[in-house]
């Protein structure tokens, strides 16, 4: 149950998809990946105020309890709701091969 | 790929399952739930240091980029990996009914 998409903190401050450019060195992949040399990494970043993009009932509970006990219960967190697949050309013991990764690039975000 | 379960921050400091007692009033459910009067809410709380319980490749990327750009990229976050179902006895327009919720109580945690 995706709840409100209106961010009360101001435009772009709440949980949403961001793109971060990263080299193989940045990612620690230089020793096993040949291509691409750079990745446009999509990830979920931003605040999760009350009921904003609440992923499920658990997220709603977390919001309620965070309001009551902020030192004990953290606010919901902005994480991927789904992923886009990506291919990497990688070195293996038997040579170079193409591998598809289904859990690498965030496609959509929610709060949980 | 669940990575290391050793917490470098000390026992109990890293991402794990916690139980928080909450009343219907705490949860904002008093007007539509009859039972239970109190819930032992299991939720995921704790830090996600490098590669601790990394849920997937995305979490590993996030760790690497957080180390490089801590002001831009947040550290991975402790969230449910799976849920335990729970039943609520709730008021409806037609009376009282039993409803099972599959996404209410965290069963297992990971970092993403």
């Amino acid at each position: 149950a995706r709840n409100g998409d209106h961010c009360p903190l101001g435009p772009g401050r709440c949980c949403r998809l961001h793109t971060v450019r990263a080299s193989l060195e940045d990612l620690g992949w230089a020793d096993w990946v040949l291509s691409p040399r750079e990745v446009q990494v999509t990830m979920c970043i931003g605040a999760c105020p009350s009921q904003f993009r609440a992923a499920n009932m658990h997220a709603q509970i977390k919001t309620s309890l965070h309001r009551l006990k902020p030192d004990t219960v953290p606010a919901p967190c902005c994480v991927p709701a789904s992923y886009n697949p990506m291919v990497l050309i990688q070195k293996t013991d038997t040579g170079v091969s193409l591998q598809t990764y289904d859990d690498l690039l965030a496609k959509d975000c929610h709060c949980i | 790929a669940r990575n290391g379960d050793h917490c470098p921050l000390g026992p109990g400091r890293c991402c794990r399952l916690h139980t928080v007692r909450a009343s219907l009033e705490d949860l904002g459910w008093a007007d539509w739930v009859l039972s239970p009067r109190e819930v032992q809410v299991t939720m995921c709380i704790g830090a996600c240091p490098s590669q601790f319980r990394a849920a997937n490749m995305h979490a590993q990327i996030k760790t690497s980029l957080h180390r490089l750009k801590p002001d831009t990229v947040p550290a991975p976050c402790c969230v449910p990996a799976s849920y335990n179902p729970m039943v609520l006895i709730q008021k409806t327009d037609t009376g009282v009914s039993l409803q099972t919720y599959d996404d209410l109580l965290a069963k297992d945690c990971h970092c993403i």
Epitope: R37, P85, V87, I89 | -
Partner: antibody
């Protein structure tokens, strides 16, 4: 298993437009890093790169042929279409489509021979 | 466009003997990040080309290790340590440093 298959006319007349379709399976053109390219090989000659299209709809056309070429994709149908206008007998060749992953060209169709003749 | 020139254009080798094919590019294929964008393909009779060597020296997974690639910025060599009957066909070098990717004219390998 990855397969690509080219389809289209085997004979076209000079000045006509050639439309070739590459139908593929075993991969998705919505995957980051994936593309489909068209390459041709005139009888007894070297391979020549014509055009390619990426997952994000970025396209490349060989400069020498750019004005004659159009490449499009239909991700839901797993198809890439190449059109080439104003065909000439020198365009007689075997036309291949191939899967690309960045600079890694690992899977090719079997090719289709197109003859341009009146 | 970058011009790729192969020698010899044909080659007849006794099974079990080595074979070597040369390829020269009209411009250095060594990129500033240390990668050489040179590739070797084999087109067996009646078949489509298949990738053998990736980025000058990386053997593609599934390709027998009797094949090897080497070279510098503009001069490249494909070696077959012991030719087998299944190695017959036309070998192409190609560059992907600049668009369009360009191919050599091919070297036909026959068995004596």
């Amino acid at each position: 298993q990855i397969t690509l298959k080219e389809s289209g006319p085997t004979l076209v007349k000079p000045t006509q437009t050639l439309t070739l379709t590459c139908t593929f399976s075993g991969f998705s053109l919505s995957t980051y890093g994936i593309g489909v390219g068209w390459i041709r090989q005139p009888p007894g000659k070297a391979l020549e790169w014509l055009a390619h299209i990426w997952w994000n709809d970025n396209k490349y056309y060989n400069t020498a042929l750019k004005s004659r070429l159009t490449i499009t994709k239909d991700t839901s149908k797993n198809q890439v279409v190449l059109t080439m206008t104003n065909m000439d007998p020198v365009d007689t060749a075997t036309y291949y489509c191939a899967r690309l992953a960045y600079d890694y060209v690992d899977s090719w169709g079997q090719g289709t021979l197109v003859t341009v003749s009146s | 466009d970058i011009v790729m020139t192969q020698t010899p254009l044909s080659l007849s080798v006794t099974p079990g003997q080595p074979a070597s094919i040369s390829c020269k590019s009209s411009k250095s294929l060594l990129h500033s990040e240390g990668i050489t964008y040179l590739y070797w393909y084999l087109q067996k009779p009646g078949q489509s080309p298949q990738l053998l060597i990736y980025q000058m020296s990386n053997l593609v997974s599934g390709v027998p290790d009797r094949f090897s690639g080497s070279g510098s910025g503009t001069d490249f060599t494909l070696k077959i340590s012991r030719v087998e009957a299944e190695d017959v066909g036309v070998y192409y070098c190609a560059q992907n440093l600049e668009l369009p990717p360009t191919f050599g004219q091919g070297t036909k390998l026959e068995i004596k």
